[in-house]
């Protein structure tokens, strides 16, 4: 046993660890060369090369010119060939290939579970206010709002079909007009793109296949964003999904028919069911105004019930809303009548694990939260790295060719309409638009599926999930039948509209191109990632909420100068590229601004800075307890990390690099943490970074 | 039991007020309305008003709206019922009776106070 | 305000006879209705309510019927004890109101 196992599988050559690697990795500085340590038992331990995929210098630095990181990378087989084998070789080469099938459908299976109990999450931490954004009557008249209430809505509670069905009661009872409800439909559908979003980070320890995920990931919400970009002002303009949709409904009589089938619901709701259960109806009454749902828990108590009809004398404010004269009297004072009454008689309680937990659903929730995310996190990394271990030689080939060639040359073009369909029909099946790209993630990260290749993918998703809500709403009862499917059908002609936009012209598939662009930011500074997420799909639909609280002068006042510096940027950056010559000089690149205003660079070392000391303080706590557990159980061979020293002997120590446990891609998930003193000074102060800027 | 004790008669000059008081007892104050019924010498019953103690809402008949005020004092389970601007015509019995819950029925009537108003 | 009449306004029976005392709403109560007897110098007594619901305590002998406008108050056996007035009343809406009464005497 090595007194650093980490150390143990050090790659002799490190340059096969990382793509584009051209030479050799920088020499350790020579005042370091002869330098050992020693470690706790007294004996030296030689200083061990960095590998590439550890070093902040590599991490940072951009790829080699004529290195395209979007390139496809090249699955190579290392394993031993078929024809080399011996038949017990072959026989185990089998089981193994078969283990490796079952286990990543047990992964695939944890993780399209995870998602369901996120969704859950998310709903008992959010719900509740999520029901009260649509409670808000007044507000949703105005365009602007009721979409990023949609988006609003749908990133608190995970799921779009949560806030469609909420939507569509309002408009069945007349809380909200059909006109009022399309931006809301149009943020639901940019809501329910972040969950592969948040899925995308969880491949942030490889920086290539985090560059390729994430972009894959956020191409969907560029679409949405975009389309909305562009539909929005048009229909507030000229109503045209509103008179489309009723055109078509008056053309066709819809007659009720059967809901979508729900195959994967059938696989996953056994499991899920046993972890919690919620009472959907709690929100969507929260939303319909109802103030007794306000104390109302999300969580599934019972789950058998009967109802029993019961005449009860109830009072009304006045004899007006008596069920007739007869059965209308007065106490003197209040005037009663008889009401049917439904009771609700519990018979069985529901089998999850917080049925019996007097928690509130915040507490849960964020209980769930956590564990989803943990499980969400480990099947992904899983599921890449089973995946990394099957795509390899020829299987990699075939899979990257079938879902990546196009067809021979004149119906090339048909190939992508193709991919929609896949992704429509895909998702038509798992009943989840979310589910459907949140898999495809992965594969985009280890380079399965290019980003162009995933763009009609996640279109067809869209359509998938739209073509549901359409036999959903087939299947709804009489009363809803015409507004859940007028809703539906808007829902549908705007990702058609969206994909008429930014799909059939290649030059207009101006979300690939924003994708990378953010996916290559991304990359260099992971934690713009997280930035991106939050503003986009949070701090900047509540500012706009807020705003729109205040009143229509308000947000115009605040927004329009907004509106109006970004289109001036965009002008400016449109200008630098293609024809600089007429703009003054000073104006031809963005150094007359402070470099805070058009680089991340200052924001990266300020986010490292913040994030070393974290650091420091998460490794102290570890070292602590990992030295009790050491002494409780008497084992010597165990280490505790070194993170946390002082800073006299931090300064005293030489700066030794280490290679992360091998068992993960991910820094963030090493055993051992890197002496931080020194080493956060110079990667701070490299010279081979080069500052990436924002415009 | 259920008890309803009213105030001892009282003798009024017209244009004068009334204060009528009646004491509960045997249930609880704050769940059942209580309403206050005349009877003038000779004639059938007129209804008054009534109040509901648990939060002193009150409905008045019409005929007495401006003239009557109705109280309810929950520390001393007492109601009171004031009338005012009295005229010789408003001579009568004056009876509290508790309501029934939920409905209009008076199931405990008080004993009755005579009320003469006379110059 | 919804008229409440008795009818007839005076009764004249002896002890042992089955006595029916009407009353005739001027609209639609429902079962709103309550009967009260009265004896002189006491106050009202509730015997029925909801038209046919007998109040607790009050003997079987007597008895409500009716619905809407027309409501009737049967005694079956008069005994001594119920000579007295009787009343009707409508708790359909605000105001209540009573009927005139209806004096039952002994023959």
């Known amino acids: 046993m090595a007194p650093w196992p980490e150390l143990e599988n050090a790659h002799p050559n490190p340059n096969k660890f990382i793509e584009g690697a051209s030479g050799p990795q920088s020499s350790i500085p020579d005042k370091d060369k002869g330098t050992s340590k020693t470690n706790d038992s007294g004996t030296p331990v030689a200083k061990i090369e960095l590998l590439p995929s550890y070093s902040a210098l590599v991490l940072i630095e951009e790829p080699p010119e004529g290195n395209d990181p979007w390139d496809l990378p090249e699955l190579q087989d290392n394993g031993i060939k078929w024809s080399e084998r011996d038949s017990k070789g072959k026989i185990l080469c089998i089981f193994q290939g078969i283990g490796k099938f079952i286990l990543l459908l047990g992964f695939l299976y944890l993780f399209v579970c995870s998602l369901d109990v996120l969704s859950s999450a998310f709903q008992l931490v959010g719900g509740k206010m999520a029901g009260q954004f649509f409670s808000n009557n007044s507000i949703m008249s105005n365009p602007v709002a009721g979409l990023v209430i949609g988006v609003l809505v749908t990133v608190m509670v995970q799921s779009s079909s949560t806030s469609s069905s909420i939507i569509v009661s309002m408009v069945a009872s007349s809380l909200l007009s059909v006109r009022a409800a399309i931006p809301i439909i149009m943020g639901a559908n940019i809501g329910t793109s972040i969950t592969n979003t948040i899925v995308a980070l969880m491949q942030a320890g490889d920086r290539n296949e985090f560059r390729r995920a994430f972009a894959g990931a956020t191409v969907h919400d560029f679409f949405n964003w975009l389309s909305v970009l562009v539909l929005l002002p048009l229909e507030a303009a000229t109503h045209y999904l509103e008179k489309l949709t009723n055109l078509v409904l008056e053309t066709f009589s819809f007659q009720n028919g059967e809901d979508a089938p729900d195959i994967l619901k059938v696989i996953t709701d056994p499991f899920t069911k046993l972890i919690i259960q919620l009472d959907k109806k709690v929100i969507q009454q929260i939303a319909m105004g109802d103030s007794e749902a306000q104390n109302k828990s999300l969580i599934k108590i019972w789950c058998k019930t009967i109802s029993n009809v019961i005449e009860e004398n109830v009072t009304v404010p006045s004899p007006d809303n008596c069920t007739s004269p007869s059965y209308c009297w007065t106490d003197g004072i209040q005037t009663w009548t008889i009401q049917n009454v439904t009771e609700k008689e519990n018979i069985a309680k529901c089998q999850h694990i917080f049925v019996n937990f007097s928690l509130p659903d915040l507490a849960v929730g964020i209980i769930l939260l956590t564990v989803s995310l943990l499980i969400l996190c480990g099947c992904l990394i899983m599921i890449v790295k089973l995946l990394g271990s099957v795509l390899r030689g020829q299987v990699a080939t075939v899979i990257k060719k079938t879902l990546n060639t196009d067809f021979p040359f004149p119906f090339a073009w048909l190939t992508g309409y193709l991919a929609i369909l896949v992704g429509a029909g895909m998702t038509f099946i798992v009943q989840s638009s979310s589910v459907f790209t949140s898999a495809m993630t992965p594969l985009i990260g280890i380079g399965v599926i290019s980003i162009e290749r995933a763009y009609p993918l996640t279109l067809g998703s869209n359509i998938g999930t739209t073509t549901t809500a359409i036999l959903a709403a087939l299947a709804s009862p009489g009363n809803t039948l015409r507004s859940s499917l007028q809703i539906a059908l808007c829902h549908f002609f705007f990702n058609i509209s969206g994909i008429l936009l930014w799909y059939p012209i290649p030059f207009t598939r101006l979300p690939i191109r924003l994708a990378k662009g953010l996916g290559n930011i991304s990359a260099k500074y992971r934690w713009f990632a997280v930035f991106y997420l939050i503003f986009f799909f949070l701090l900047t639909p509540l500012t706009v909420f807020g705003l729109s609280l205040a009143g229509w002068p308000v947000l115009v006042g605040v927004g329009v100068p907004i509106i109006l510096l970004i289109l001036l940027v965009l002008c400016l950056r449109m200008l630098q590229a293609r024809c600089p010559r007429i703009l003054p000089l000073k104006l031809r690149d963005w150094n007359f601004l402070p470099l805070w205003m058009h680089s991340l660079k200052p924001w990266d070392n300020i986010i490292s800075l913040a994030t070393s000391c974290f650091q420091r303080r998460c490794c102290c706590c570890c070292r602590v307890c990992c030295r009790v557990c050491c002494m409780v159980c008497g084992c010597k061979c165990c280490r505790c990390s070194k993170c946390c020293k002082n800073l006299e002997e931090e300064e005293k120590e030489q700066d030794v690099p280490v290679k992360a446990s091998g068992g993960f891609d991910n820094t963030a998930m090493s055993k051992e943490c890197q002496d931080e003193g020194k080493g956060q000074v110079e990667v701070l102060g490299m010279k081979a970074l080069s500052n990436t800027t924002v415009f | 039991q259920v008890q309803l004790v009213q105030s001892g008669a009282e003798v009024k000059k017209p244009g004068a007020s009334v204060k009528v008081s009646c004491k509960t007892s045997?249930?609880?104050?704050?769940?059942?309305?209580m309403h206050w019924v005349r009877q003038a010498p000779g004639q059938g019953l007129e209804w008054i008003g009534a109040i509901y103690p648990g939060s002193g809402a009150t409905a008045y008949n019409q005929k007495f709206k401006g003239r009557v005020t109705m109280t309810a004092d929950t520390s001393t389970s007492t109601v009171y019922m004031e009338l005012s601007s009295l005229r010789s015509e408003d001579t009568a019995v004056y009876y509290c009776?508790?309501?029934?819950?939920?409905?209009?029925?008076?199931?405990?009537w008080g004993q009755g106070t005579l009320v003469t108003v006379s110059s | 305000d919804i008229q409440l009449t008795q009818s007839p306004s005076f009764l004249s029976a002896s002890v042992g006879d089955r006595v029916t005392i009407t009353c005739k709403a001027s609209q639609d109560v429902g079962t709103a209705v309550a009967w009260y007897q009265q004896k002189p110098g006491k106050a009202p007594k509730l015997l029925i309510y909801w038209a046919t619901t007998r109040h607790s305590g009050v003997p079987s002998r007597f008895s409500g019927s009716g619905s809407g406008t027309e409501f009737t108050l049967t005694i079956s056996s008069l005994q001594p004890e119920d000579f007295a007035t009787y009343y009707c009343?409508?708790?359909?809406?605000?105001?209540?109101?009573f009927g005139q009464g209806t004096k039952l005497e002994i023959k």
């Open positions: 045997g249930y609880t104050f704050t769940t059942n309305n």
């Open positions: 009776a508790r309501g029934m819950y939920g409905h209009g029925a008076m199931d405990y």
């Open positions: 009343q409508q708790y359909s809406s605000n105001p209540l109101t």
